[in-house]
Interface confidence: medium
């Protein structure tokens, strides 16, 4: 079930000819507000291209902007996991990364950005206007998603800008902490006040929002705890499903796990132990459509192509099996 | 050894739940995803879910998302299934099973499985 | 989903003989060189047993005169030479997608 909220975004002032001070003063208190409510909040970035080589190839990447630990990023299409949306790939620190069709390159790009890569070609690739989510679950935040597609008049090549626009979902409470945007915020409210307070004061005004308004579009919580705070949000339903996936599929997009880790811990024989020896990488990544689930030791940072061995916390084994590059 | 006990048989009504355990031995049941398949008398076999009891990930079937909730205890190595709203149509035996672990492979192909449990839905 | 069709539906084969079970995908489930198929064994009131992974990997402990083949959208279970206790219903599994899926199972019968 998806539950929706729609909520006005806030919109600057128009200043008119008079009371333009008055509407610069009266939304000091809101601009207070706001910088105390977002000071210390993450947001989630989303940005989509189109590969210019591949014409239904997508990259997708995603980034956290917070102070928190990740301990889990999950990226669908369609709509937010679990609302509508179907799984594309669940990457966790430790564990590794699980990726399904047409997932075909997930990877960390930085201790905080991850990307993905789809297939170009078959029923199940992507097309151009498929809204893609991504949901960072950290500590002490709580669990943040946000959803980009590409520009309806996109070139091949060119990507949709980083678009912060993140679904907040403050799974945890006390989502407050002072960061520098409150910093600068009231060094900078404290400035406009010393400017203007020998103003006369303002009239009262209604506010006016624009229709054409971006709107918060918030997905309910799964759990009843989870407060949603909503931020201006716009998203792109998407018409195009995938041919090979259910709609209705909340969790399923297919296939298997992907290994991940650069800086990988390996696991001996025996499941009960853990080595710390690292086993060096020789490049990011390489796609294991079998359902490889890797131990990363560290959340690699951004290398170049390559291969990388992949050990895994998941039992005694050595490297075997298929290791095919999608 | 490595084995997967499954909660003994259930009989319900129309419209109630039943929650179905699996508890694991001879092997860290956050070593692999367990599996949930279904299978209706003198039917084929169907995959429900699976999670991955480490973190707590799911993944199910789409037609088994209303109907089935699946978590884990890794505290007492027990995969839980709760089936709710049931109907006849969810008359079956119901097995748990292990995510083959071989090498650092998976693949969603399942080498253990439990005996099953029995749920019948009856008025 | 991809839909897994087996045939036969069922099968007779007489002791020491073999038995030929096909398995076909509605679409590809291959992908850089791997198969993404399974093939299991059920014996009535049993769970069903893990023969062969990825298509031609026999599975630990399975007798050697079980053996997969096939690629793309075609598999193949053999069992060669068929013995008393291999009378059960065989199933196909893929694993490309979520979700994977089985065959409507061959049910193997020993003349």
């Known amino acids: 079930m998806r539950t929706e909220a729609q909520v006005p975004a806030l919109q600057p002032p128009e200043p008119g000819l008079e009371g333009a001070m008055g509407h610069r003063t009266l939304v000091l208190p809101w601009v207070l507000l706001t910088l105390c409510v977002t000071a210390g909040t993450p947001e989630v970035w989303v940005q989509v291209r189109m590969e210019a080589t591949e014409l239904s190839s997508f990259t997708i990447r995603c980034g956290f902007l917070g102070s928190g630990s990740i301990s889990l990023v999950t990226v669908s299409w369609g709509g937010p996991n679990g609302a509508g949306g179907t799984t594309l790939a669940v990457l966790h620190p430790e564990r590794g990364i699980r990726q399904w069709a047409p997932a075909r390159q997930a990877r960390w790009e930085t201790q905080s950005s991850i990307s993905l890569i789809l297939e170009g070609s078959g029923a199940s690739s992507p097309c151009a206007n498929t809204t893609f989510c991504c949901k960072f679950a950290s500590f002490p935040e709580g669990s943040w998603e946000a959803c980009g597609s590409l520009p309806p008049s996109s070139d091949p090549g060119l990507s949709a800008p980083p678009t912060p626009a993140p679904i907040l979902r403050a799974d945890l409470a006390g989502i407050l902490g002072v960061s520098g945007v409150l910093l600068f915020g009231c060094v900078y409210l404290l400035h406009l006040l010393r400017r203007h307070k020998h103003r006369p004061a303002p009239r009262l005004q209604p506010s006016r929002t624009s229709p054409q308004a971006p709107r918060a579009r918030a997905w309910a919580p799964s759990q009843a705890s989870q407060a949603a705070l909503h931020v201006p949000y716009a998203t792109i339903n998407t018409s195009c499903r995938p041919a090979t996936l259910d709609t209705a599929h909340p969790h399923g997009g297919p296939s298997w796990w992907a290994s991940l880790p650069t800086h990988a811990a390996h696991r001996p024989q025996g499941p009960a132990a853990w080595a710390s020896t690292p086993i060096p990488a020789r490049g990011s990544f390489v796609s294991v459509e079998n359902g490889l689930y890797a131990q990363a030791g560290e959340r690699p940072p951004h290398t170049g192509p390559g291969l990388t061995l992949f050990p895994d916390p998941r039992g005694p084994r050595a490297m075997e099996g298929p290791l095919g590059v999608r | 050894e490595v084995q997967l006990q499954q909660s003994g048989a259930e009989l319900a009504k129309p419209g109630a739940s039943v929650k179905l355990s699996c508890t694991v031995s001879?092997?860290?049941?956050?070593?692999?995803?367990i599996h949930w398949v279904k299978q209706r008398p003198e039917q084929g076999l169907e995959w429900i879910g699976g999670?991955?009891?480490?973190?707590?990930?799911?993944v199910s079937a789409s037609k088994f998302q209303d109907k089935a909730t699946i978590t884990a205890d890794t505290s007492s190595s027990t995969a839980y299934m709760q089936l709710s709203s049931l109907t006849s149509g969810d008359t079956a035996v119901y097995y748990c099973?292990?995510?083959?672990?071989?090498?650092?492979?998976?693949?969603?192909?399942?080498?253990?499985w439990g005996q099953g449990t029995s749920v019948t839905v009856s008025s | 989903d991809i839909v897994l069709t087996q045939s036969p539906a069922s099968l007779a084969v007489s002791l020491g003989q073999r038995a030929t079970i096909s398995c076909r995908a509605s679409?590809?489930?291959?992908?850089?060189?791997?198969?993404?198929m399974h093939w299991y064994q059920q014996k009535p009131g049993q769970p069903p047993k893990l023969l062969i992974y990825?298509?031609?990997n026999l599975e630990s402990g399975v007798p050697a005169r079980f053996s997969g083949s096939g690629s793309g959208t075609d598999f193949t279970l053999n069992i060669h030479p068929v013995e008393e206790e291999d009378a059960a219903t065989y199933y196909c599994?893929?694993?490309?997608?979520?979700?994977?899926?089985f065959g409507g199972g061959t049910k193997l019968e020993i003349k």
């Open positions: 001879g092997f860290n049941i956050k070593d692999t995803y």
């Open positions: 990825l298509a031609s």
């Open positions: 599994q893929h694993s490309r997608e979520l979700p994977p899926t």
């Open positions: 099973a292990r995510e083959r672990v071989h090498s650092n492979t998976l693949y969603y192909a399942m080498d253990y």
């Open positions: 679409k590809s489930v291959s992908i850089s060189g791997y198969s993404y």
């Open positions: 999670i991955d009891p480490a973190i707590g990930n799911t």
